[in-house]
């Protein structure tokens, strides 16, 4: 799998999309996980609704939301109030049994807020030693959620 780069601005929301073959992955729940090290495990952040038929319902875990358009074949992950520590390598996954197929590898980059004059030294970018061959960059033009748009926190 090639790695797709999504760039977002600190403090704003970043939307990551993962397209997939809707028939190949029919009936399968999806998940968003964070890669721990280059060869390490992928730690589950959030997964779609336990009932596949309700996968269109947005599920939150902290500041990360997931929703699945199972007919169109697009998994969408929203990272709200993006922070420097959110930068890193993630995966969109299709679940079957206890196993997971990788739909897309995603590198999240957090850019400094141009309106924020604080030190941007802690913002993370992949170093030269970290090579993401054939990485495709998708710039995500985001804005902060308005007060009325803030979704309810997860109930469980």
């Amino acid at each position: 799998h090639n790695t797709t780069v999504f760039q977002g601005v600190a403090g704003q929301s970043l939307q990551v999309s993962c397209p997939y073959d809707s028939m190949k992955h029919w009936g399968r729940r999806k998940a968003w996980c964070r890669q721990l090290g280059e060869k390490g495990p992928c730690q589950r952040v959030v997964s779609t609704h336990n009932l596949w038929l309700l996968s269109f319902l947005r599920r939150w875990n902290g500041s990360t939301a997931i929703t699945d358009d199972t007919l169109g074949g697009t998994l969408t992950i929203t990272l709200r109030n993006l922070q420097p520590h959110d930068a890193g390598l993630y995966q969109c996954q299709s679940l079957h049994g206890s196993e997971a197929d990788t739909l897309r590898k995603v590198l999240v980059e957090v850019l400094a807020d141009p309106l924020d004059h604080r030190d941007a030294g802690d913002l993370w970018f992949p170093g030269e030693s970290e090579s993401f061959e054939d990485a495709h960059v998708e710039h995500s033009i985001s804005r902060s959620l308005l007060e009325g748009e803030i979704p309810f926190p997860p109930t469980s």
């Epitope: 190949k24 399968r28 009932l51 038929l53 049994g97 206890s98 196993e99």
Partner: antibody
Framework: EVQLVQSGAEVKKPGESLKISCKGS????????IAWVRQMPGKGLEWMGI????????RYSPSFQGQVTISADKSISTAYLQWSSLKASDTAMYFC????????????????WGQGTLVTVSS | DIQMTQSPSSVSASVGDRVTITCRAS??????LAWYQQKPGKAPKLLIY???SLQNGVPSRFSGSGSGTDFTLTISSLQPEDFATYFC?????????FGQGTKLEIK
């Protein structure tokens, strides 16, 4: 009506090559995974591997990796299992089966099976 | 690989009897388990999936239960056409693995 129709019985000699087939009908062939399952005489069922005809994504059981090749031709709704050099121990009944994902639990089960192809390898 | 162990390997029973076959997985597989029936010279037929869901067209005398490592297939009242071999199969992970089979014979 969903059907998987397999090619006929084969008698081969050790070292010969063979390709058996499984033709799907009555459903969208490119939208379901097809598995191959071996059953040696009087024995149980062994999962060999699986293919998604839509894009030819293929996975093998470690026990069969390198021993057989699974392929598909979506234009004629047919999946294949082939050997480049048969051994006497390949003598078995081979079934193809459609794998269906049941959305209740997001896992896969074999809901339709071919009638089986008996392969006999003997000198 | 996950090992699936069925017991008994064979069982003799009469028409009308209640029969239970068990299947044990070498590790937890949640409810990702199927049961198949196979008659001599025929392909297996899916009876139960997700441990307890009855496949369309399968008589209600067949039922499945269990989760984790221990599962059962129950036939509440044996019919003549039920004499066959039954296999369990885990759908937790690849490679998919089957139990060795339980042959149900007429007493």
């Amino acid at each position: 009506e969903v059907q998987l129709v397999q090619s006929g019985a084969e008698v081969k000699k050790p070292g010969e090559s063979l390709k058996i087939s499984c033709k799907g009908s009555g459903y969208s062939f490119t939208s379901y995974w097809i598995a191959w399952v071996r059953q040696m005489p009087g024995k149980g069922l062994e999962w060999m591997g699986i293919i998604y005809p839509g894009d030819s994504d293929t996975r093998y059981s470690p026990s069969f990796q390198g021993q057989v090749t699974i392929s598909a031709d979506k234009s004629i709704s047919t999946a294949y299992l082939q050997w480049s050099s048969l051994k006497a121990s390949d003598t078995a009944m081979y079934f193809c089966a459609r794998q269906r994902t049941f959305y209740y639990d997001s896992s896969d089960y074999f809901d339709y099976w071919g009638q089986g192809t008996l392969v006999t390898v003997s000198s | 690989d996950i090992q699936m162990t069925q017991s008994p390997s064979s069982v003799s029973a009469s028409v009308g009897d209640r029969v239970t076959i068990t299947c044990r997985a070498s590790q937890g597989i949640s409810s990702w388990l199927a049961w198949y029936q196979q008659k001599p010279g025929k392909a297996p037929k899916l009876l139960i999936y997700a441990a307890s869901s009855l496949q369309n067209g399968v008589p209600s005398r067949f039922s499945g239960s269990g989760s984790g490592t221990d599962f059962t297939l129950t036939i509440s009242s044996l019919q003549p056409e039920d004499f066959a071999t039954y296999f369990c199969q885990q759908a937790d992970s690849e490679p998919r693995t089957f139990g060795q089979g339980t042959k149900l014979e007429i007493k």
